[in-house]
Interface confidence: low
C-alpha cells in the first residue's frame, strides 16, 4: 500500500517531520533509514531504522485526585523491518503501572448558615438591586471542599424616585462612499457622516442636558490611489536536479509574478511560485553498523588450573559483541569486539550472608491484566571475601582491578520461614484501563 514519506523522525515526540510526499511504497521510502512514514495522515509515525523501544511516556495523571490510586505509562516499539528486544513487533505498546496519591484526604462539602439581612438599595433614584449574604460554616467544609450554591443573592429594589436623563450621542454612522475610487475624476470626491442624540435622548421631566457638538461632519476624500493592476504569472522555469545521491529527494520548478507586475495596490498572483516533485535515485542509502549489547561474561578461569572457585586466585574472563545492520557500504562499528577483565570466581561458593532492607515497591503487574499487585523483597545478600581489589599480573604492567564473578550460595538465618528471599505483596488500587494513545486521539 502507498504511504506518506517524511525525511525526519523526531525521537522525542515520535512525530514525522519534513513531508516528502505520498503515493510511494514503504520499501522505497525506507531506502533511506533516516526517513519515516505514515500509513495515513495523522496516523502513527514509524521510522525506517531498525525497530527499538521508544522512551517511556510521562506518567499519566493519577486515576483519582484524592486517596491512593494508580497511574500508567507506556512505550512503543518503533521502526521498520525487524523486531524490538523481547521479539516484539513494531507498533506494539508496553505498559507500566504504579501506585500514586495526589492528595491524602478527599474534600467534604460544607453547609450554609442562614441568610443575613438585606443591604441598602444600590442606587438613590429609579431601580437598583440589593444583596444579602450567608456564611459557609454550618458545617465548615473540609479538605478543600466548598458549599453548594451561592454565598450571596440579589433582588430588584425601587427607590420610587425618577432620575434625569442627559443626552448622549449615538456612535457616528458610516462615511458615505466617495464618488470615485481612483484619483483623476471630474468632481472632487467628498464623504459625510452623521450621528443622533439618542443614546439616550435627554429627558423632559426632570429635564436632562442636550448633546454637545454637531450632528454632521463632512471631509474631502484624500489619498485616493491610482487604479490598480493585477499581477500575472510568467512561465515555469526548468526543473532543478535531484539533490540526493540515494533514496528519494525533491526537485523544484519556479515561476515569477511579472506578466504583468502588480501595480498601484493590484493583487499579487494567486497560487504558488514553486512546485515540487519527488525524484527517485533507486539507490539504497548506506546503513552504518551498530553494536549489539555485550554478551555474557565467560566463566572466570586461570590457564593450567582446573578450578579457581572459592580461592584467592585471580583469573580472567571475556565477553563479546556483534556488529549488526551494516549495509550498502555503511560505516563499520567503532571500538572493540571483545572485552577482557580480571576476576575472582565465587561460583557456587558457600558464603555468610545478611538480610537486606526492604526494596522499594515494584511496578504493578500485570499492568493491563486483572487484579494487578505490587511487591517488595528482602534478599539474603552474600558478604564478599576481603580479597585484594587489584592485582599485578605481569611485572611492570601496573595494577589491574579484579571483579568478583559467579553466583555464590549465601547463608542467612531463617526469616519468616525463608532462607533466600522474603516477599510482601499488595493489590494496586483504582486501576485505569490500558488504551492505545494513538486511537484515543481519533
Amino acid at each position: 500500500d502507498p504511504v506518506l514519506c517524511f525525511t525526519q523522525y523526531e525521537e522525542s515526540s515520535g512525530k514525522c517531520k519534513g513531508l516528502l510526499g505520498g503515493g510511494v511504497s514503504v520499501e522505497d521510502c525506507c531506502l533511506n533509514t533516516a526517513f519515516a512514514y505514515q500509513k495515513r495522515s495523522g496516523g502513527l509515525c514509524q521510522p525506517c531504522r531498525s525497530p527499538r523501544w521508544s522512551l517511556w511516556s510521562t506518567w499519566a495523571p493519577c486515576s483519582v485526585t484524592c486517596s491512593e490510586g494508580s497511574q500508567l505509562r507506556y512505550r512503543r516499539c518503533v521502526g521498520w523491518n525487524g523486531q524490538c528486544s523481547g521479539k516484539v513487533a513494531p507498533g506494539t505498546l508496553e505498559w507500566q503501572l504504579q501506585a500514586c496519591e495526589d492528595q491524602q484526604c478527599c474534600p467534604e462539602m460544607g453547609g450554609w448558615s442562614g441568610w443575613g439581612p438585606w443591604e441598602p438599595c444600590s442606587v438613590t433614584c429609579s431601580k437598583g438591586t440589593r444583596t444579602r449574604r450567608r456564611a459557609c460554616n454550618h458545617p465548615a467544609p473540609k479538605c478543600g471542599g466548598h458549599c453548594p450554591g451561592q454565598a450571596q443573592e440579589s433582588e430588584a429594589c425601587d427607590t420610587q424616585q425618577v432620575c434625569p436623563t442627559h443626552g448622549a450621542w449615538a456612535t457616528w454612522g458610516p462615511w458615505t462612499p466617495c464618488s470615485a475610487s481612483c484619483h483623476g475624476g471630474p468632481h472632487e470626491p467628498k464623504e459625510t457622516r452623521s450621528r443622533k442624540c439618542s443614546a439616550p435622548e435627554p429627558s423632559q421631566k426632570p429635564p436632562g442636558k442636550p448633546c454637545p457638538g454637531l450632528a454632521y461632519e463632512q471631509r474631502r476624500c484624500t489619498g485616493l490611489p491610482p487604479c490598480p493592476v493585477a499581477g500575472g504569472w510568467g512561465p515555469w522555469g526548468p526543473v532543478s536536479p535531484c539533490p540526493v545521491t540515494c533514496g528519494l529527494g525533491q526537485t523544484m520548478e519556479q515561476r515569477t509574478c511579472n506578466h504583468p507586475v502588480p501595480q498601484h495596490g493590484g493583487p499579487f498572483c494567486a497560487g504558488d511560485a514553486t512546485r515540487t516533485h519527488i525524484c527517485n535515485t533507486a539507490v539504497p542509502c548506506p546503513v552504518d553498523g551498530e553494536w549489539d549489547s555485550w554478551g555474557e561474561w565467560s566463566p572466570c578461569i586461570r590457564r593450567n588450573m582446573k578450578s579457581i572457585s572459592c580461592q584467592e586466585i585471580p583469573g580472567q574472563q571475556s565477553r563479546g559483541r556483534t556488529c549488526r545492520g551494516r549495509k550498502f557500504d555503511g560505516h563499520r562499528c567503532a571500538g572493540q569486539q571483545q572485552d577482557i577483565r580480571h576476576c575472582y570466581s565465587i561460583q557456587h561458593c558457600p558464603l555468610k550472608g545478611s538480610w537486606s532492607e526492604w526494596s522499594t515497591w515494584g511496578l504493578c503487574m500485570p499492568p493491563c491484566g486483572p487484579n494487578p499487585t505490587r511487591a517488595r523483597q528482602r534478599l539474603c545478600t552474600p558478604l564478599l571475601p576481603k580479597y585484594p581489589p587489584t592485582v599485578s599480573m605481569v611485572e611492570g604492567q601496573g595494577e589491574k582491578n579484579v571483579t568478583f564473578w559467579g553466583r555464590p550460595l549465601p547463608r542467612c538465618e531463617e526469616l519468616q520461614g525463608q532462607k533466600l528471599v522474603v516477599e510482601e505483596k499488595r493489590p494496586c488500587l483504582h486501576v485505569p484501563a490500558c488504551k492505545d494513545p494513538e486511537e484515543e486521539e481519533l
Epitope: C66, C106, P107, E108, M109, G110, G111, W112, S113, H138, P139, G145, C147, P148, G149
Partner: nanobody
Framework: QVQLVESGGGLVQPGGSLSLSCAAS????????MGWFRQAPGKEREWVAA????????YYADSIKGRFTLSRDNAENTVWLQLNSLKPEDTAVYYC??????????????????????WGQGTLVTVSG
C-alpha cells in the same frame, strides 16, 4: 431545579409498619444524595437517614438504626423509607431533601440540614394505639 413530593404517611399502631416514598422531578436526580428529616410537634427538625447518589453508602441516625430502611431507584427517580417497629415517639412530619453529591460522604456531612438544596412539603406519620 428538582421538585420533591413525599407520600405514604398516615395513622399506624405501635409496632406497625409504613413505607414512605419521595418522587423527584428533573433529569439530574441521580446526581444528588437524598436524605430524610422529621419534625415532631414543638420540637427541632431531626435528621433520620441519608443515601449517596449511587446507593453505595447509607447512613442512619442512632435513634432509628435497625428499624428503618432507606433505598433508591435512579431509573424511577424515587427514594423509599421503610418504617418498621414504629413507636409513639416516631410521630412527626417526615421531609425528603436533596443534597449535592460527588466525592463527599460521611454521617457528619449528610446529617447537617444546611447541605440540602431542595426540600419536599412533608408527609405526616402518626403512631397511636
Amino acid at each position: 431545579q428538582v421538585q420533591l413530593v413525599e407520600s405514604g404517611g398516615g395513622l399506624v399502631q405501635p409496632g406497625g409498619s409504613l413505607s414512605l416514598s419521595c418522587a423527584a422531578s428533573g433529569r439530574t436526580f441521580s446526581s444528588y444524595a437524598m436524605g430524610w428529616f422529621r419534625q415532631a410537634p414543638g420540637k427541632e427538625r431531626e435528621w433520620v437517614a441519608a443515601i449517596t447518589w449511587s446507593g453505595a453508602n447509607i447512613y442512619y441516625a442512632d435513634s432509628i438504626k435497625g428499624r428503618f430502611t432507606l433505598s433508591r431507584d435512579n431509573a424511577e427517580n424515587t427514594v423509599w423509607l421503610q418504617l418498621n417497629s414504629l413507636k409513639p415517639e416516631d410521630t412527626a412530619v417526615y421531609y425528603c431533601a436533596a443534597a449535592e453529591s460527588g466525592r463527599y460522604s460521611g454521617r457528619a456531612y449528610y446529617s447537617a440540614p444546611g447541605v440540602y438544596l431542595y426540600w419536599g412539603q412533608g408527609t405526616l406519620v402518626t403512631v397511636s394505639g
